[in-house]
């Protein structure tokens, strides 16, 4: 059958030894009683760690209580509480326990005390000169109106800078976009289609309302 010391009936770190009738606890300094359950430690002994406040225990017969500061627990405030286990940081932020305070270390693209502000969304994001904000892939960008460029569409862009006219066509900037003046033998908005010798072309059917060679809006 189970021995009298099974499960260690001695509290507060006491060691148990079997006796002919039952068991006996050898108590560590500062404790006594059948099961070492009575504390002989008083507040005068300074039993509270980590800045804990000791209350009571003025005489050996009355127990003391440690009131622990934030971040600590245990009868003597000896255990550090993992306050970060509450996961206070949003959007994948890392929790940092300074000791006196918790702080959130935010991933790129997020900010705020709890990393609650998404810097990559279009909310409150202004794209200048008629540009529109486009979200995607955890980032945002401005899709700029023709003639503008840059991160916020604040820079004037030359629509002809990218040489959009194929096959030697000449590009002209126009208030509504750009116009390609095609070299002989080519046609289309970007001079992309060769004109066949018989007068036909490899041009696909034009969308309604747009003649081949018209500027694209």
């Amino acid at each position: 059958g189970p021995g009298p010391c099974d499960g260690n009936p001695c509290a507060n770190g006491g060691s148990c030894s079997e006796t002919p009738r039952s068991f006996e606890c050898t108590c560590p300094r500062g404790f006594y009683g059948l099961r070492c359950e009575v504390s002989g430690v008083t507040c005068a002994d300074g039993p509270c760690f980590n800045g804990g406040l000791c209350v009571g225990g003025a005489d050996p017969d009355s127990a003391y209580i440690c009131h622990c500061p934030p971040g600590f627990q245990g009868s003597n405030c000896e255990k550090r509480v993992d306050r970060c286990s509450l996961q206070p940081c949003r959007n994948g932020g890392l929790c940092l326990d300074l000791g006196h305070a918790l702080r959130c270390r935010c991933r790129a693209g997020f900010a705020g005390p709890r990393c609650e502000h998404d810097l990559d969304d279009c909310a409150g994001r202004a794209c200048a000169n008629g540009g529109t904000c486009v979200e995607g892939g955890g980032a945002h960008r401005c899709s700029c109106a023709l003639g503008f460029g840059g991160r916020d569409c604040r820079e004037r862009a030359d629509p002809c800078a990218a040489r959009p006219c194929a096959h030697g066509g000449r590009c002209y900037a126009h208030f509504s976009g750009l116009v390609c003046a095609c070299a002989p033998g080519y046609m289309g908005a970007r001079c992309e289609f060769p004109v066949h010798p018989d007068g036909a072309s490899a041009l696909p059917a034009a969308p309604p309302g747009l003649r081949p060679g018209d500027p694209q809006r």
């Epitope: 500061p69 550090r80 305070a101 918790l102 702080r103 270390r105 790129a108 900010a111």
Partner: antibody
């Protein structure tokens, strides 16, 4: 509650030097502590902190040049290989701040500060 | 990384006057800003935390304000004892650059 630095002296370049910050009136396990330095006639420059749990963090320029550690009552700053540019007064300070990072109450600050200890690096 | 830019580097005013010191953060710091006063040969002294909270024992002549990236320290009814260098400081917590507590470059206040 107070903090005080010690260990500052004249050293030759390359000779490691350890500064000590001794605290009284509060527990180092409860507070983060910081080192800040000030070169003669210059502004304040943050070096690094050590959290209540003992984790150090450094300014990018200070990584590898300094090591912060602590015991139950003192915090140390080791200048691993001092150069003349490390000549400065070194301050230690306790970090205070709102307990949790919430939008309504969110601040960090250094208080109290020690009087500083002067390190002179010269050949 | 977070950069704190303080202006002006020096300001002069007469006793009884008012001075304004500006601190600009390179990004939103959500009012997590402290102001310190340092006199020659002395340790820095905390004046204001959380952008606008006056530290205990600091005269109400010192006023902190601002939000987002722009912050101001205003000293009114200037006294000779206010002659010092003033520093702003914030905190920066990211996963990429660990943590930072950068100071502004400082502003010298001269009282005439």
């Amino acid at each position: 509650q107070s903090v005080e630095e010690s260990g500052g002296r004249l050293v030759t370049p390359g000779t490691p030097l350890t500064l000590t910050c001794t605290v009284s009136g509060f527990s180092l396990s409860r507070y983060a502590m910081s080192w800040v330095r000030q070169a003669p006639g210059k502004g304040l420059e943050w070096i690094g902190i050590i959290t209540g749990g003992g984790d150090p963090y450094y300014a990018s320029w200070a990584k590898g040049r300094f090591t912060i550690s602590k015991t139950s009552t003192t915090m140390d700053l080791k200048i691993t290989s001092p150069t003349t540019e490390d000549t400065a007064t070194y301050f230690c300070a306790r970090m205070i701040g709102s307990e949790y990072a919430s939008s309504s109450e969110y601040y960090d600050a250094f208080d109290p500060w020690g009087p500083g200890t002067l390190v002179t690096v010269s050949s | 990384a977070l950069v704190m830019t303080q202006t002006p580097s020096s300001v002069s005013a007469a006793v009884g006057g008012t001075v304004t010191i500006n601190c600009q953060a390179s990004q939103n710091i959500y009012s997590n800003l402290a102001w310190y006063q340092q006199k020659p040969g002395q340790r820095p002294k905390l004046l204001i935390y959380g952008a606008s909270n006056l530290e205990s024992g600091v005269p109400s002549r010192f006023k902190g304000s601002g939000s987002g990236t722009e912050y101001t320290l205003t000293i009114s009814d200037l006294e000779c004892d206010d002659a010092a260098i003033y520093y702003c400081q914030s905190a920066y917590y990211t996963t990429s650059v660990d943590v930072l507590y950068p100071f502004g470059g400082g502003t010298e206040v001269v009282v005439k």
